[in-house]
Interface confidence: medium
């Protein structure tokens, strides 16, 4: 790719595409990023991340006016984390019940852990190209949060947009709408 | 330099099928879009829609849904336009079309040399 | 759709003369990216359009620098300072900010 012609994506949340009919990949295919948990040989105060899942993502992606050549392959962090003492009887009463409503006031949710940065080249309906620099996630973990954190911020640790590379008079400016897309 | 070389004049009777190609040269050609124009006589022009060359994926203009299919062959570096069920509203001057490397929506710098599609009884 | 309206449909020219085409789109032509995708293309008779005018007002590598254009939001101008008698055809606005990408109808100019 052009490094002077690569423009940032500020989110790679963008309109999902449907794969090419000759394409064998997955979509969407979760799995529990190899999280296990056992009601065996640990003590009480041993806690197992239950919930957190990755699901693993394939998708073209389109900007609206262009559409990557190849599908993108990255993780979506979703669902709640359920950090729980391990004990038989950990799904209903019990210690169980007492445990959580001690620390109602704290959620454990499923956050991106590791991401990096690739460059996707995409072809566009004017028969010209464009190459984008986005942010995908490459791991998943459960972290910790009050229930004062303001609850609709869930981009927890997600990069920060860097700023956008200017080139050839192409003058860029994030948009309201650039959280999900750039058209 | 950039070419692309399309296929000669058709005449069609109505109901039957026309398939157009399209051959690029000059560039790598899946690494960019193929676009589609349609020019009836006397007439503006009209995009059609492109097909991601890499991936295959067509896209259409809502007007250009149903009877037009857009395809590749890759080894060859031809795309193609099939137009089936032919009416007479189909007869125009069909042209592949592709845009500047890097540099999106900065015009159509390339065309094809358009094919004559006549839909006659 | 954006359905991009131009004006005049004819347009007799003095040779050295100046000439002007407007063109105005149905809605804003300014990508959320700051960029305006409003492009001129000439085509001269039997022949495919070429490319003129890209993003309002950059010119394509090759153009004379007769040839302008101006404009923002919904109103654009391609203007040509001196008509020479190769610039006769059909010129072409179009617009690539919104899909589908669309086309004017078309403004014929011709030598008086």
């Known amino acids: 790719f052009k490094n002077d012609a690569t423009e940032i994506l500020y989110s790679h949340v963008v309109k999902p595409v449907p794969a090419h009919p000759s394409s064998n990949s997955t979509l969407n295919q979760a799995r529990n990023g190899g999280r296990h948990f056992s009601n065996t040989g640990l003590d009480r105060n041993t806690r197992v991340q239950v919930g957190c899942r990755e699901l693993r993502s394939t998708k073209y992606i389109s900007d609206g006016q262009c559409t990557s050549i190849s599908p993108l392959k990255e993780l979506v962090c979703a669902g709640e984390c359920l950090p729980l003492p391990v004990l038989p009887n950990w799904i209903g009463g019990g210690y169980g019940t007492k445990y959580w409503s001690r620390r109602s006031s704290q959620e454990w949710r499923c956050v991106n852990d590791k991401t990096r940065t690739q460059r996707i080249q995409l072809q566009c309906q004017d028969g010209s190209t464009r190459t984008y620099k986005i942010t995908v996630v490459t791991a998943c973990k459960c972290k910790r949060y009050t229930r004062q954190h303001n609850e609709s911020s869930h981009n927890f640790e997600s990069m920060s947009p860097a700023k956008p590379v200017q080139h050839h008079r192409e003058r860029k400016r994030a948009s309201k709408s650039s959280k999900h897309s750039m058209s | 330099q950039v070419q692309l070389v399309q296929s000669g004049a058709e005449v069609k009777k109505p109901g039957a099928s026309v398939k157009v190609s399209c051959k690029a040269s000059?560039?790598?050609?899946?690494?960019?879009?193929m676009s589609w124009v349609k020019q009836a006589p006397g007439q503006g022009l009209e995009w059609m829609g492109w097909?991601?060359?890499?991936?295959?994926?067509?896209t259409y203009a809502d007007d250009f849904k149903g009877r037009f299919v857009f395809s590749l062959d890759t080894s060859v570096s031809t795309a193609y336009l099939q137009i089936n069920s032919l009416k007479a509203e189909d007869t125009a001057v069909y042209f592949c079309?592709?845009?500047?490397?890097?540099?999106?929506?900065?015009?159509?710098?390339?065309w094809g040399q358009g094919t004559l599609v006549t839909v006659s009884s | 759709d954006v359905v991009m309206t131009q004006s005049p449909l004819s347009l007799p020219v003095t040779l050295g003369q100046p000439a002007s085409i407007s063109c105005r789109s149905s809605?804003?032509?300014?990508?959320?990216?700051?960029?305006?995708?409003l492009h001129w293309y000439l085509q001269k008779p039997g022949q495919s359009p070429q490319l003129l005018i890209y993003?309002?007002?950059n010119r394509f590598s090759g153009v004379p620098d007769r040839f302008s254009g101006s404009g923002s939001g919904t109103d654009f101008t391609l203007k040509i300072s001196r008509v020479e008698a190769e610039d006769v055809g059909v010129y072409f606005c179009?617009?690539?900010?919104?899909?589908?990408?669309?086309f004017g109808g078309g403004t014929k100019v011709e030598i008086k």
């Open positions: 000059g560039y790598t050609f899946t690494t960019y879009g």
């Open positions: 993003k309002v007002s």
């Open positions: 097909i991601n060359t890499y991936s295959g994926v067509p």
């Open positions: 179009s617009q690539s900010t919104h899909v589908p990408l669309t």
């Open positions: 809605q804003s032509l300014e990508h959320s990216n700051g960029n305006t995708y």
């Open positions: 079309v592709r845009g500047r490397e890097y540099y999106y929506g900065s015009g159509i710098a390339f």
